[in-house]
């Protein structure tokens, strides 16, 4: 898989592959994987990809199911890169406050908050 | 501050306090704090709260600015609680796949993806 494929296209293709291979993936009836209990997905990327690792180790590889796991691995790589960019730029306090304000604003309007 | 205050109300109040105390907070001209370079805030909560800690240690405390940092500490506590819930429930593969599909769907439609 060329890593040059845009991440957005990669995500779309992975969604399709996930749908295609669902029957194969759920064949293991006894396997249990941690599932986050809320929808703030970005907070749980580590656990999601640990779960993917568990699933991959229990799935017979070959054909396009292999491509599915390769895609998921590239998505993980992208997210790891994004995480690295969390602390790269050192800025003046006013810029940090603008980012913090935006973060809280998004939390206020978009997060699923259960008290 | 009662921890029973709903998190959504806490976030709203914190946004207001942030605006009120901006001039005091930016007074340190030479301080530099890491600022994430993308809008996927949830990936960067650790760095954001490290930055808040740096800012708090450089800010003269007292009055409602103290309340601002207490609020931010409660918001951190809430997020830490959410992170704990990422791996608490072990579920069958089909439920994990549903969550993974939703995660990729959200990534596809809502994330700011730069290739």
């Amino acid at each position: 898989i060329p890593t040059e494929i845009p991440t957005s296209a990669l995500v779309k293709e992975t969604l399709a592959l996930l749908s295609t291979h669902r029957t194969l993936l759920i064949a293991n009836e006894t396997l249990r994987i941690p599932v986050p209990v809320h929808k703030n997905h970005q907070l749980c990327t580590e656990e999601i990809f640990q779960g993917i690792g568990t699933l991959e180790s229990q799935t017979v590889q070959g054909g396009t199911v292999e491509r599915l796991f390769k895609n998921l691995s590239l998505i993980k790589k992208y997210i790891d890169g994004q995480k690295k960019k969390c602390g790269e730029e050192r800025r003046r306090v006013n810029q940090f406050l603008d980012y913090l304000q935006e973060f809280l604003g998004v939390m206020n309007t978009e997060w699923i908050i259960e008290s | 501050i009662p921890t029973e205050i709903p998190t959504s109300a806490l976030v709203k109040e914190t946004l207001a306090l942030l605006s009120t105390h901006r001039t005091l907070l930016i007074a340190n001209e030479t301080l530099r704090i890491p600022v994430p370079v993308h809008k996927n805030h949830q990936l960067c909560t650790e760095e954001i709260f490290q930055g808040i800690g740096t800012l708090e240690s450089q800010t003269v405390q007292g009055g409602t600015v103290e309340r601002l940092f207490k609020n931010l500490s409660l918001i951190k506590k809430y997020i830490d609680g959410q992170k704990k819930k990422c791996g608490e429930e072990r579920r069958r593969v089909n439920q994990f796949l549903d969550y993974l599909q939703e995660f990729l769907g959200v990534m596809n439609t809502e994330w700011i993806i730069e290739s």
Partner: antibody, heavy 117, light 109 residues
């Protein structure tokens, strides 16, 4: 390497609104570590800061121009814009867009706007 | 609002040292940035945070800042250094950017 390019009319009539757009390439306007700024330079004079905007839409303006200036951002097009209303001959200048981290790190090449009837 | 004052012009012979000042109330407590601008071109940063040089800027360019004056020093001046030089600070009381009026450096001869 981030590049900025100003675009807009080079001639504006007095009392009208000057409108310029800056297109950012080689980087995202949603970069949390950058502000996006407009600066102008009257012929033979020094640099004058007009204002800047954060990707979230927070704006900061030069007090001497605040009543006439609007800066906006379009993250989907990776662009930000300047509008300066009620222009006079005194607004004739080279207008620069620039990215602003801790300092002005990348600049457009500048565009001369003349206010004349 | 905060004001920065620069001399309109400074002249120096090649090989000599040029000093361009930027005055402001208690400027020593702020970070100062210096830009070089040649005719028909956009400004280029030559010194940031009082005395740090970006990559690609010769060591001949240096800066200092204390009290009410920041100084850009160009040693062993070359003809190619002839340009306008502007200082810049942030006014943290308002989150505003402030530029000095600019100084024209003329290299004699």
């Amino acid at each position: 390497q981030v590049q900025l390019q100003e675009s807009g009319p080079g001639l504006v009539k007095p009392s009208q609104t000057l409108s310029l757009t800056c297109t950012v390439s080689g980087g995202s306007i949603s970069n949390g570590g950058q502000y996006w700024s407009w600066i102008r330079q009257h012929p033979g004079k020094g640099l004058e800061w007009i204002g800047y905007i954060y990707y979230s839409g927070s704006t900061y303006y030069n007090p001497s121009l605040k009543s006439r200036v609007t800066i906006s951002v379009d993250t989907s097009k990776n662009q930000f814009s300047l509008k300066l209303s009620s222009v006079t001959a005194a607004d004739t200048a080279v207008y620069y867009c620039a990215s602003l981290g801790n300092w002005f790190d990348y600049w457009g090449q500048g565009t001369l706007v003349t206010v004349s009837s | 609002s905060y004001v920065l004052t620069q001399p309109p012009s400074v002249s120096v012979a090649p090989g000599q040292t040029a000093r361009i000042t930027c005055g402001g109330n208690n400027i020593g407590s702020k970070n100062v940035y210096w830009y070089q601008q040649k005719p028909g071109q956009a400004p280029v940063l030559v010194v940031h945070d009082d005395s740090d040089r970006p990559s690609g800027i010769p060591e001949r360019f240096s800066g200092s800042n204390s009290g009410n004056t920041a100084t850009l020093t160009i040693s062993r001046v070359e003809v190619g250094d002839e340009a306008d030089y502007s200082c810049q600070v942030w006014d943290s009381s308002s989150d505003h950017v402030v530029f000095g009026g600019g100084t024209k450096l003329t290299v004699l001869g």
